[in-house]
């Protein structure tokens, strides 16, 4: 028997406020380099211990970035992602879409807590 | 264990050219991105400029864009940079600084924390 995955979307403001040395995180993505396949959105690929973002707790490792300080990150260049965060100044507002995996019961059974239900 | 090799260094004078060049071996070369810091006497190591070929990004400090460029030889497993219309304030030992970038790149100014492995310097003077 196999267990269907399914995935829950939920998206969250992240309002960071930047350390010492800087916001503490790594993104991958872009229309230069896709990090999802047909995807050229922003992903936080690596959350730097100690960081801003690591000790605000919120952002996490697979996040998709949507916005930064209210202006969309669609259809950016690897380089200009990073150029727009590392001139976000010093409060950084996040829109994120995060994506967290549901493993539901059997194929044909929807267990308790179903959220397809 | 990467190792990092710098060489070009010289004394010019105000307003003249400068090719450095560092060479790496020991790593996968174009996995890692590459930099260039300085250190004058008395100061605190600064960074130059930065080059990530695996994540197509390139990154110059206020007080050298415009006049040095930054570049890398996959090939030849070379770092370059180029310093165009040298000034007196340049002056200092240069270092090549490398650290692997699989995990994307960082949002924040680089800082000399985030590299693994540096060269041995190279002195520029410029008079």
């Known amino acids: 028997m196999n267990g269907r995955v399914d995935y829950l979307v939920t998206e969250e403001e992240i309002n960071l406020t930047r350390g010492p040395s800087g916001l503490g995180f790594n993104i991958v993505g872009g229309t230069d380099q896709q990090y999802v396949s047909n995807d050229s959105g922003i992903y936080v690929s690596r959350i730097k211990e100690n960081g801003a973002a690591a000790l605000d707790g919120r952002l996490q490792e697979g996040d998709k970035i949507l916005s930064v300080n209210g202006q969309d990150l669609k259809n950016l260049l690897h380089q200009d992602a990073v150029d727009l965060f590392r001139n976000a100044g010093y409060a950084v507002s996040l829109r994120v879409q995060h994506r967290l995996q549901v493993q539901n019961g059997p194929i044909g059974h929807r267990g308790e807590g179903d959220p397809s239900g | 264990e990467v190792q990092l090799v710098e060489s070009g260094g010289g004394l010019v004078q105000a307003g003249a050219s400068l090719r450095l060049s560092c060479a790496a071996s020991?790593?996968?070369?174009?996995?890692?991105?590459m930099a260039w810091f300085r250190q004058a006497p008395g100061k605190e190591r600064e960074f130059v400029a930065e080059?990530?070929?695996?994540?197509?990004?390139?990154w110059y400090s206020d007080s050298v864009k415009g006049r040095f460029t930054i570049s890398r030889d996959n090939a030849k497993n070379t770092v370059y940079l180029q310093m165009n219309n040298l000034k007196p304030e340049d002056t200092a030992v240069y270092y090549c600084?490398?650290?692997?970038?699989?995990?994307?790149?960082?949002?924040?100014?680089?800082?000399?924390?985030?590299?693994?492995?540096w060269g041995q310097g190279t002195q520029v003077t410029v008079s």
């Open positions: 600084a490398a650290y692997c970038d699989y995990s994307g790149s960082t949002v924040d100014p680089p800082n000399q924390s985030e590299y693994d492995y």
């Open positions: 080059d990530s070929w695996s994540n197509h990004r390139v």
């Open positions: 020991g790593g996968t070369f174009s996995s890692y991105a």
